[in-house]
């Protein structure tokens, strides 16, 4: 189930580059978020708090990838029109609870301004 | 139904301290986090915490950290909210509420009836 | 600390008119959820995630906004619409309500 279109600017061009950001809000401290190309998931990215506030990040399909207190930034390179399609980001909240999944997500255009080497 | 019930009114003096409970029913206690808002006479709404049923986290606004202490009771479905080192301007009516979320942020889905606490020598 | 100043602090309209309820925000929220509170009440979830309604609530109100103006509206007054509304954003630590907005009868 599609919960809706992202509410932010879900891509970020740079250099041959997309930065996809998958925003989540900051009060949640446990979750795993997923980057889907279609049906397909290219990465996920898990957060975990154990005793003492210990913070423990896993991926089990790894991407380049960078966390902050309310998103997380995957990270695909070298562009083509073959990455044009639609991406989602499949969120599951675990903790605080209640357990949540969203999935928000939009489609990435590829413009050959985009291919290579361009700063936006 | 869905139900947060709270404590009764409480009548304090400066510097002490005063715990504020909310009994949850109708639902799964640990399956939702509980917030907990307080509201001045005349004043707004101004949120003073967060805790997790599941994983006892809690999170502060930094305005009452170090003086609000947030706790549960699984086995009776209760939280607790206790503020210390009080002063008159802690004189407010206390609410706990159910966190939820939508597809973008989080909100209080319902709430409790409200607990008044006055503060005064 | 991002501040919502709602406006205006006092509308005073008559049963059947149309109401529009403002929330500005000190910087861009992702989201605005919007309470209603009667004296002597808790508030009452109204509308979350900007525009969808809460369970029960009618569909006379509605939410729209983005960025750093948000906006409720009521279509068409009913008596127990008088009230006080709060919005309240939860994507800025710390999170925070806006002063309200005291909706009240002609």
């Known amino acids: 189930e599609i919960n809706g279109s992202a509410n932010y600017e879900m891509f970020i061009f740079h250099n041959g580059g997309v930065q996809i950001l998958c925003k989540y809000p900051d009060i949640v401290q446990q979750f795993k978020m997923q980057l889907l190309k279609g049906g397909q998931i290219l990465c996920d990215l898990t957060k975990t708090k154990g005793s003492g506030n210990t913070v423990s990040i896993k991926s089990l399909k790894f991407c380049h990838s960078q966390l902050s207190n309310n998103s997380v930034s995957f990270f695909l390179y070298n562009l083509d029109h073959s990455h044009a399609n639609y991406y989602f980001c499949n969120l599951s909240i675990f903790d605080p609870p209640p357990f949540k999944v969203t999935l928000t997500g939009g489609y990435l255009h590829i413009y050959e301004s985009q291919l290579c080497c361009q700063l936006k | 139904q869905v139900q947060l019930v709270q404590s009764g009114a409480e009548v304090k003096k400066p510097g002490s301290s005063v715990k504020v409970s909310c009994k949850a029913s109708?639902?799964?206690?640990?399956?939702?986090?509980m917030h907990w808002v307080r509201q001045a006479p005349g004043q707004g709404l101004e949120w003073i915490g967060l805790i997790s049923i599941y994983s006892d986290h809690t999170n502060y606004n930094q305005k009452f950290q170090g003086r609000a202490t947030m706790t549960v009771d699984k086995s009776t479905s209760t939280a607790y909210m206790e503020l210390s080192s009080l002063r008159s301007e802690d004189t407010a009516v206390y609410y706990c509420?159910?966190?939820?979320?939508?597809?973008?942020?989080?909100?209080?889905?319902?709430w409790g009836q409200g607990t008044t606490v006055t503060v005064s020598s | 600390e991002i501040v919502l100043t709602q406006s205006p602090a006092t509308l005073s309209l008559s049963p059947g008119e149309r109401a529009t309820l403002s929330c500005s925000a000190s910087s861009s929220v992702s989201y605005m959820h919007w309470y209603q509170q009667k004296p002597g009440q808790a508030p009452r979830l109204l509308i979350y995630?900007?525009?969808k309604l809460a369970s029960g609530i009618p569909a006379r109100f509605s939410g729209s906004g983005s960025g750093t103006d948000y906006t409720l509206t009521i279509s068409s007054l009913e008596p127990e619409d008088f009230a006080v509304y709060y919005c309240f954003q939860g994507s800025g630590y710390p999170y925070t309500f806006g002063q309200g907005t005291k909706l009240e009868i002609k």
């Open positions: 509420g159910r966190n939820n979320y939508g597809n973008y942020g989080w909100y209080f889905d319902v």
């Open positions: 109708g639902y799964t206690f640990t399956d939702y986090a």
């Open positions: 995630d900007t525009s």
